[in-house]
Amino acid sequence: VEVKVPTEPLSTPLGKTAELTCTYSTSVGDSFALEWSFVQPGKPISESHPILYFTNGHLYPTGSKSKRVSLLQNPPTVGVATLKLTDVHPSDTGTYLCQVNNPPDFYTNGLGLINLTVLVPPSNPLCSQSGQTSVGGSTALRCSSSEGAPKPVYNWVRLGTFPTPSPGSMVQDEVSGQLILTNLSLTSSGTYRCVATNQMGSASCELTLSVTEPSQGRVA
C-alpha cells in the first residue's frame, strides 16, 4: 500500500481541531487495517504510541488522546485515512504515523509521517535584570515566556520620552530576549517593556531600571 501524506508540517492553533490528511490507493480487502500512532518531539519512531486502530470493520481509539481522536471517514476504506484530533493541547505537538496494511498489497511499507505543531500564544513573560546599575556600568535585562509555539521573538522598548541612547549602548537579542545596556547614565533610568510575539499573539512585561551615581570611595 502506498500512503500519501502532506510534505509540509501541519500547524493548528491551541484548542482547535487538527486534520491530519492521509490517503492511499489499494483494493481494500477484509484484512485491511489502519493504525495511527504518535511520537513525541525528539523521540525515535520506534517509541511511537498507538492512538487509534481500525480493523475488522471496527474503530478502536486508544491511549490518552482516545476521547479526542476520530476518522474523517469511518470506515476508512475509501482511500481516505485522515485523522481528526479535537481540542489540541501543547502536548499534541509531535510526529503522527499513518500506517495502512492490506495484504497482499506489500508494494511499499504503507507508512506516512506528519509533523504537527500546536500553535500557542506567548504566556506573560517574566522580566528580570542583572548587572551593575550605577553610572558607567552595564546591565542585562532578560525576558522569557514559559509558553509559546512557535518560540516567541522578544522586543524591548523604553517607555516615555528620553534622549536617544548612543549607538551601541543598547543591544538586544530577539531570540534570547536579552537587552544589554552599556555605559549607563542617569538618563538610562526608566521603564522598559518587553513584548513577546509569535503568530498567535503577544504578551508583555515591564521592568523599572534605576541608575545610581557610583558610591564615592574614601581614602583613610
Epitope: 490517503t23 490507493s25 481494500v28 480487502g29 477484509d30 470493520g57 476504506t77 475509501v78 497482499p104 508494494y107
Partner: antibody, heavy 118, light 107 residues
Framework: EVQLVESGGGLVKPGGSLRLSCAAS????????MSWVRQAPGKGLEWVAS????????HYPDSVKGRFTISRDNAKSSLYLQMNSLRAEDTAVYYC???????????WGQGTLVTVSS | DIQMTQSPSTLSASVGDRVTITCRAS??????LAWYQQKPGKAPKLLIY???TLPEGVPSRFSGSGSGTEFTLTISSLQPDDFATYYC?????????FGQGTKVEIK
C-alpha cells in the same frame, strides 16, 4: 484462464428490481476484490459498486447508494448486484470486473444489458 | 469527487501514426491512473495501470506517462487492431471515475 460471466439482465419497469449475477472462474475468487461497472448506450464507463475479498466492505457512488447492493458468495465464486428502485438512467450494460491489488479492473465479463423502461 | 477529462474526444489517424491521448484529473491523483481499450460490443481491456505499467500481454507500442493531474497514453505506431475507444480511470480514492473516452478512428 480468467472468466467472468454475467447474467440476469433484461427489461424492467421504472421502480422495479433486478438481480444480476456474475460467475467467476480461472482465479482464486475469494482473494479478489470485485466491482460492477456500467455503460449506458453510446456513453462512457461508470463504476457502480465494489466489494472486498471476503465481503466485509462495500462501496458505492452517490448515484446508486441506497438502491443497489453488491454481495458475493465465495463458496460459489459468484458476485451479485441487487438493483432496486430502478430508473430510466440505470439503463446500461453492466460489467462484472475483477480488481487488481490497486483498484483498477484487470479482467472484465462480457456484460449484461439492463433496460429500464415502461 | 475527482473528475477525469480526456482530449480529444475523437481522433482520426492512419496506420503507422504516433497517437497521443491526454487525460486530466481535477485534483492530484499521483500516479494512480489506468487506461483501457474498448472495441464496439466488447468489454474494456486493461492497457496500463499506475500511469505507466503495462500488464502482461499488452503490446509495447502502448505507453503511459504523467503524474499529478496530467497523463498521456501514447501508441507509437498505430496498428489496424488499435482503432477503438480509450478510457482513463483514476484508481485513487473512491469514487473511482473514468474519462468520457477518446475514439480513435481511421482517417
Amino acid at each position: 484462464e480468467v472468466q467472468l460471466v454475467e447474467s440476469g439482465g433484461g427489461l424492467v419497469k421504472p421502480g422495479g428490481s433486478l438481480r444480476l449475477s456474475c460467475a467467476a472462474s480461472g482465479f482464486t475468487f475469494s482473494n479478489s476484490g470485485m466491482s460492477w461497472v456500467r455503460q449506458a448506450p453510446g456513453k462512457g464507463l461508470e463504476w457502480v459498486a465494489s466489494i472486498s475479498d471476503g465481503g466485509l466492505y462495500t462501496h458505492y457512488p452517490d448515484s446508486v447508494k441506497g438502491r443497489f447492493t453488491i454481495s458475493r458468495d465465495n463458496a460459489k465464486s459468484s458476485l451479485y448486484l441487487q438493483m432496486n428502485s430502478l430508473r430510466a438512467e440505470d439503463t446500461a450494460v453492466y460489467y462484472c470486473a475483477r480488481q487488481g491489488v490497486r483498484p483498477f479492473f484487470d479482467y472484465w465479463g462480457q456484460g449484461t444489458l439492463v433496460t429500464v423502461s415502461s | 469527487d475527482i473528475q477525469m477529462t480526456q482530449s480529444p474526444s475523437t481522433l482520426s489517424a492512419s496506420v503507422g501514426d504516433r497517437v497521443t491521448i491526454t487525460c486530466r484529473a481535477s485534483e492530484n491523483i499521483y500516479s494512480y491512473l489506468a487506461w483501457y481499450q474498448q472495441k464496439p460490443g466488447k468489454a474494456p481491456k486493461l492497457l496500463i495501470y499506475n500511469a505507466e505499467t503495462l500488464p502482461e500481454g499488452v503490446p509495447s507500442r502502448f505507453s503511459g506517462s504523467g503524474s499529478g493531474t496530467e497523463f498521456t497514453l501514447t501508441i507509437s505506431s498505430l496498428q489496424p487492431d488499435d482503432f477503438a475507444t480509450y478510457y482513463c480511470q483514476h484508481h485513487y480514492v473512491i469514487p473511482w471515475t473514468f474519462g468520457q473516452g477518446t475514439k480513435v478512428e481511421i482517417k
